[in-house]
């Protein structure tokens, strides 16, 4: 969470904005809120990214105004202008790429003042795992799958009977290029597993860490997922 | 000097639908939202919904939201707020008012009576 | 929606004194709330918006103040065209919501 002031002659604008992930070839959002203003028509709010020239957007007069925008943005922002009303200047990116990484800056001018900060946009890649049992190996076994990462992530596998085991040694775990060529499919099988157990296979990196929970018993199979964005807020 | 004006008191039958005007300034709306706030006797300020024509935008409450319809004419500067199937609870006072986020200027009320 | 409460809900307090109201919102609006007065027969007045920002032509014994989900109107020196209804209004996030208002009489 960062906050900004500004000052225009004796008034100043509150602007906080967090920090966020994206997830490319994803649509991603770039968060900004200000102090709300009646006057809508002297809202403007810019977002520029370190190291380039030119906007990322422009909006003013009630518009967009894309006429400065940098090519590398091009047909890729928005901002919620409903939302504009109650001080939400939020960017909407389209198709996160990884070169879209970068220190943003949220700057916001209204009738009161005007303000800015700035926030850290990381991207990579991160997905849900789905774990399932192996019926088809020599022992029964979990085979954990997410099928989008970027960076290669650290995978662990943890249980609840046995709090604390390093499950390195009878644990697999590979990593698969998919066809565009930066993210990665990420499978992990866990062998010897026993019955009326959870097992929790956890993927993490430096933008997202997943958990995927796997109950098994004699009549049924529970499963669990969770996602969470890391340096987030 | 902001002045909102709107159309007058009306009796009107469950069922039917209902219409009311407000006319602004031109520096009103272009520059500002318009929210239309209603309020039953004895009870407290109902947001309903507001426009924002500089911005194109439409917003309801969810307990409106499928039976009002809020509208701007840029041309004449009026903004409409139309209710349909009308009930005995939709009966009170209905303010247009220059804002969100908050309301700096209201319009004089128009009191609508819902009645068989 | 954001659900917005006000205490008390009537208040007698004598001329000359001073009244505090509060309002509560259900999760946090930060700054962005405003108060009205409302007299029976008219449309409501904007007094403060952001909290404690006086709007125009507001005198400077009714002050604002809070954060975050409690707030306070604050008139003092109550004079005899302040007693109406007060209530608060949070504009966070859509949908706008009002408080049911405060009851201010003379005592």
């Known amino acids: 969470l960062i906050i900004g002031f500004g000052i225009s002659g004796k008034h100043f604008i509150t602007v906080t904005t967090f920090t966020s992930a994206g997830n490319i070839g994803e649509d991603g959002t770039l968060s900004c809120t200000f102090e709300p203003d009646i006057k809508l028509n002297g809202i403007v709010i810019q977002w520029l990214k370190e190291g380039i020239k030119g906007l990322v957007h422009e909006f003013k007069e009630g518009k967009d105004d894309l006429s400065q925008q940098h090519e590398m943005f091009r047909g890729r922002t928005a901002v919620f202008a409903d939302q504009v009303v109650v001080g939400n200047a939020s960017l909407r990116l389209k198709n996160v790429q990884l070169t879209d990484a970068g220190t943003y800056t949220c700057y916001i001018r209204t009738s009161k003042g005007k303000g800015n900060a700035n926030l850290e946009y990381k991207t990579g890649a991160f997905s849900m795992p789905e774990i399932n049992v192996d019926y088809n190996a020599s022992s029964e076994s979990l085979r954990c799958e997410a099928p989008r990462w970027f960076p290669q992530p650290t995978v662990a596998w943890a249980s609840q009977v046995d709090q604390g085991a390093n499950f390195s040694e009878v644990s697999n775990t590979s990593f698969e290029l998919n066809s565009e060529n930066v993210t990665m499919k990420v499978v992990s099988v866990l062998y010897n597993v026993t019955i009326n157990n959870t097992y929790s296979c956890m993927i993490e990196n430096d933008i997202a860490k997943a958990t995927g929970d796997i109950k098994v018993t004699d009549s049924e199979v529970k499963r669990r997922s969770q996602l969470q964005l890391l340096n987030s807020g | 000097q902001v002045q909102l004006v709107q159309s007058g008191a009306e009796v009107k039958k469950p069922g039917s639908s209902m219409r009311v005007s407000c006319k602004a300034s031109e520096d009103t709306f272009s520059s500002y939202a318009i929210s239309w706030v209603r309020q039953a006797p004895g009870q407290g300020l109902e947001w309903m919904g507001g426009?924002?024509?500089?911005?194109?935008?439409?917003n309801y409450a969810q307990k409106f939201q499928g039976r009002v319809t809020i509208t701007a004419d840029k041309s004449t500067s009026t903004a409409y707020m139309e209710l349909s199937s009308l009930r005995s609870e939709d009966t009170a006072v209905y303010y247009c008012?220059?804002?969100?986020?908050?309301?700096?200027?209201w319009g004089q009320g128009t009191l609508v009576t819902v009645s068989s | 929606e954001i659900v917005m409460t006000q205490s008390p809900a009537s208040l007698s307090v004598s001329p000359g004194e001073r009244a505090t109201l509060s309002c509560r919102a259900s999760?946090?609006?930060?700054?962005?709330l405003a108060w009205y007065q409302q007299k029976p027969g008219q449309a409501p007045r904007l007094l403060i918006y952001g909290a404690s920002t006086r709007a125009t032509g507001i005198p400077a014994r009714v002050s604002g103040g809070g954060s975050g989900t409690e707030f306070t109107l604050t008139i003092s020196s109550l004079q005899s065209e302040d007693f109406a209804v007060y209530c608060c209004q949070q504009y966070k996030n859509w949908p706008f919501t009002f408080g049911p208002g405060t009851k201010l009489e003379i005592k």
């Open positions: 008012a220059r804002g969100g986020p908050y309301f700096d200027y």
């Open positions: 426009t924002a024509p500089i911005f194109g935008t439409t």
């Open positions: 999760q946090s609006v930060s700054s962005n």
